[in-house]
């Protein structure tokens, strides 16, 4: 499975499409600032598997394809970016789950690691609970969307467990 | 590694105008913000505004508005800023400074060497 | 437009003592405070952000401190290479804000 070349590029396709939704500048919603405390100590100090990274990378990836699909999201963003973000996001779970078949055969189960799937839910659960509190503003969404591109670029070290081999 | 270098020393008239540039290199030049600070001779700091070029649009200080344009060319890498009807007062060294990737623009964590510009008659 | 006020503007310090900078903002900024070190004809470096977090591969003899309005920059043993002009910066909104200055001097 040569998952990370493939990942990188759509990883990067993404982010470059994440950059270009913004809509108002970062300067004019500083005040919106929030603290979403993504997990990357728990990732960076984690050898992981790569079924592991993959299943973690797959959830990361889902939960942002589902919260960039709501109604509130169609409302905040230029709608043909959102889409074509949205496809790349698509793309992404496609290549991961036909990765998972490929490293673990079509009847076996990936090793899920369900402290970091949970982590990985929780701070979903967080940026939800916290673009509900501000209304859907949109400096909240501006808030959300730079919090995504970080986090985006913080999941190097799972992509370093999708390089070794099992 | 992240560099930020700026265009040379400048002496203008009151009056005239000044632009300013700083190449960037390292990282992605459209994904992180730009801003322009100045230091007259033997004083503090001031932020006068910022870029982020995927935006385009600036952010200015009200102090500068109208007087201020800051730029950026993406397909070289350098912002530019542009002072308009100069006077003694702005006399000054002018840093760009970067802010984080994929962060807000907040904390200036990289910086120009400076650029002097002097206004005199 | 959120005023910041340092004091002292100055102070004379001997190498090995500890140095205490204070920042106050016009109104709460949080925990949205940056300090900066700059020498004379250089660029600042940033020392401290988020009132309290240590910039990489900046000396863990700096430390800072505070939230909402009040705020302290601290050098528990100051260095030959300490001597230098501080600044505090508010990034809780624009237009960005710094303090006018603290030079640390030599006794």
């Known amino acids: 499975c040569d998952l990370p070349q493939t990942h990188s590029l759509r990883n990067r396709r993404a982010l470059i499409l994440l950059a270009q939704m913004g809509r108002i500048s970062p300067f004019s919603c500083l005040k919106d600032r929030h603290e979403f405390r993504f997990p990357e100590e728990e990732f960076d100090g984690h050898q992981f598997q790569k079924t592991q990274a993959i299943s973690v990378l797959h959830e990361m990836i889902q939960q942002t394809f589902n919260l960039f699909s709501t109604e509130d999201s169609s409302a905040a963003w230029e709608q043909s970016l959102l889409e074509k973000f949205s496809t790349e996001l698509y793309q992404q779970l496609n290549d991961l789950e036909a990765c998972v078949i490929q490293e673990v055969g079509v009847e076996e189960t990936p090793l899920m690691n369900e402290d970091f799937i949970l982590a990985v839910r929780k701070y979903f659960q967080r940026i939800t609970l916290y673009l509900m509190e501000k209304k859907y503003s949109p400096c909240a969404w501006e808030v959300v969307r730079a919090e995504i591109m970080r986090s985006f670029s913080f999941s190097t070290n799972l992509k370093k467990g999708l390089r070794r081999k099992d | 590694q992240v560099q930020l270098v700026q265009s040379g020393a400048e002496v203008k008239k009151p009056g005239s105008s000044v632009k300013v540039s700083c190449k960037a290199s390292?990282?992605?030049?459209?994904?992180?913000?730009i801003s322009w600070v100045r230091q007259a001779p033997g004083q503090g700091l001031e932020w006068m505004g910022g870029?982020?070029?995927?935006?385009?649009?600036?952010n200015y200080a009200q102090k500068f508005q109208g007087r201020v344009t800051i730029t950026a060319d993406e397909s070289t890498s350098t912002a530019y800023m542009e002072l308009s009807s100069l006077r003694s007062e702005d006399t000054a060294v002018y840093y760009c400074a970067r802010h984080l990737e994929y962060a807000f623009p907040d904390k200036f964590d990289y910086w120009g060497q400076g650029t002097l510009v002097t206004v005199s008659s | 437009d959120i005023q910041m006020t340092q004091s002292p503007s100055s102070l004379s310090a001997s190498v090995g003592d500890r140095v205490t900078i204070t920042c106050r903002a016009s109104q709460s900024i949080s925990s949205y405070l940056n300090w900066y070190q700059q020498k004379p004809g250089k660029a600042p470096k940033l020392l401290i952000y988020f009132a309290s977090s240590l910039q990489s591969g900046v000396p863990s003899r700096f430390s800072g401190s505070g939230s909402g309005t009040d705020f302290t920059l601290t050098i528990s043993s100051l260095q030959p290479e300490d001597f230098a002009t501080y600044y505090c910066q508010q990034s809780y909104s624009t237009p960005l804000t710094f303090g006018q200055g603290t030079k640390v001097e030599i006794k």
């Open positions: 870029i982020i070029p995927i935006f385009g649009t600036a």
């Open positions: 390292g990282g992605t030049f459209s994904s992180y913000a």
